[in-house]
Interface confidence: medium
């Protein structure tokens, strides 16, 4: 597979208004969440921190695509963002709203 | 989407001979690795332990499939297996060869 199509982090800007979360998130209006896109073909690159299961699954898929699906390119490390949100009608500050932005992708 | 096609653990038997690992794994000849198959459509079920990022990505995909890919059904918990393997020509027993079999799937 062309290297450019391999599993990697790509931009994905989330507009809270677009997903209806502006009803409870006051600020920011949106954020850069990123997403993981691309394929996980065998051999799986080291920087994609594949599990043994992912390596085996990718190898089985390579030999027989009917038997197993490809390993999947997913977030392996997420970071928090800071938000102002509504809690019982009061604006509340959450310094670390966990699991919102991708910092690393990998093959699983 | 039909419930039957939703993200879940499905059988995947690994034959070590088939993937060429019989050259160093003496026993067992193979094992039940399982794999995670199916879709992660919004709303993501609680038992699939979705991250906030996965929920948001699934929601964006629902509203605009061009903007974001679906969240992916992947192993979220792996278990070890026991193996007999060759280490510098010596047969060695490994009680816990980690990350080999899927015990839980989720949307990421």
């Amino acid at each position: 597979n062309a290297k450019g199509n391999y599993c990697k982090r790509t931009p994905l800007y989330i507009d809270f208004k677009e997903i209806g979360w502006d009803s409870w998130i006051i600020a920011p209006p949106g954020y850069e969440a990123y997403e993981c896109r691309g394929v996980c073909n065998y051999p799986l690159a080291e920087h994609l921190t594949p599990t043994k299961h992912a390596i085996i699954q990718a190898l089985v898929h390579l030999k027989n695509s009917q038997k197993a699906s490809k390993a999947c390119c997913v977030p392996t490390k997420l970071e928090p963002i800071s938000i102002l949100y509504l809690d019982k009608g009061v604006v509340t500050y959450k310094f670390k709203y966990e699991g919102m932005a991708v910092s690393e992708c990998g093959c699983r | 989407n039909a419930k039957g096609n939703y993200c879940k653990r499905t059988p995947l038997y690994i034959d070590f001979k088939e993937i060429g690992w019989d050259s160093w794994i003496i026993a067992p000849p193979g094992y039940e690795a399982y794999e995670c198959r199916g879709v992660c459509n919004y709303p993501l079920a609680e038992h699939l332990t979705p991250t906030k990022h996965a929920i948001i990505q699934a929601l964006v995909h629902l509203k605009n499939s061009q903007k974001a890919s679906k969240a992916c059904c992947v192993p979220t918990k792996l278990e070890p297996i026991s193996i007999l393997y060759l280490d510098k020509g010596v047969v060695t027993y490994k009680f816990k060869y980690e990350g080999m079999a899927v015990s839980e799937c989720g949307c990421r």
């Epitope: 006051i26 600020a27 938000i83 009608g89 009061v90 509340t92 500050y93 | -």
Partner: antibody, heavy 115, light 111 residues
Framework: QVQLKETGPDLVQPTQTLDITCTVS????????VHWVRQPPGKGLEWMGT???????DYNSAFKSRLAISRDTSKSEVFLKMDSLQTDDTAKYFC?????????WGQGIMVTVSS | QFALIQSDSMSTSAGSTVKLSCKRS????????VYWYQQHEGRSPTTMIY?????PDGVPDRFSGSIDSSSNSASLTINDVQVEDEAIYFC??????????FGGGTKLTVL
């Protein structure tokens, strides 16, 4: 009823430290947030920082490391401490309650920085 | 960091309609909520509009907030202007990192 009252000095010498207390009543500091806002004579409002209900603090970077905000929830007091005052820090200093929006303000305290 | 730009002063006559503007220097005005405050001479400010177009209890419906994307501005419209509306009006929004930004204020004179 809800009240906020700022207390502190009217006059501060240049290079000295400003200490203002905002005493609140009618609500809990663990439920509502408190802003500090100042207004130089004849000028606009300037946000200084916020004491969040959860205990977190946010500062306006314009004040760099000169500013410290703290609180004593048992006494329903929020404190503003600013070091190295200069004449252009002469202003009326307000504390204000932030619920869904800023719904209550103190009457403000006029602080003059002069020798 | 952006600035919120307001004209220094405006004059209007009682009974008329006036529109106060708050222009965002960079970035999209619609991307963060806008708040409007009224401050009478020598008094503390009060919130007139929050979340761009909502009025707190007690604020007359003569006051309304809106966003104009084409001019990248927020507006506070006062219908049927009263003498007691003479005050300074400040807009406020959020910058990235959840910092509170105020406009410089517009002094409204009612003739």
């Amino acid at each position: 009823q809800v009240q906020l009252k700022e207390t502190g000095p009217d006059l501060v010498q240049p290079t000295q430290t400003l200490d203002i207390t905002c005493t609140v009543s009618g609500f809990s500091l663990t439920t509502y947030n408190v802003h500090w806002v100042r207004q130089p004579p004849g000028k606009g409002l300037e946000w200084m920082g916020t004491m969040w209900n959860g205990g977190g603090i946010d500062y306006n970077s314009a004040f760099k490391s000169r500013l410290a905000i703290s609180r004593d929830t048992s006494k329903s007091e929020v404190f503003l401490k600013m070091d190295s005052l200069q004449t252009d820090d002469t202003a009326k200093y307000f504390c204000a309650r932030l619920g869904y929006y800023v719904d209550y303000w103190g009457q403000g305290i006029m602080v003059t920085v002069s020798s | 960091q952006f600035a919120l730009i307001q004209s220094d002063s405006m004059s209007t006559s009682a009974g008329s309609t006036v529109k106060l503007s708050c222009k965002r220097s960079t970035g999209n005005i619609g991307s963060s909520y806008v708040y409007w405050y009224q401050q009478h001479e020598g008094r503390s400010p009060t919130t007139m509009i929050y979340d761009g177009d909502k009025r707190p209890d007690g604020v007359p419906d003569r006051f309304s907030g809106s966003i104009d994307s084409s001019s990248n501005s927020a507006s506070l419209t006062i219908n049927d202007v009263q003498v007691e509306d003479e005050a300074i009006y400040f807009c406020q929004s959020f910058s990235s990192g959840i910092k509170f930004i105020f406009g410089g204020g517009t002094k409204l004179t009612v003739l």
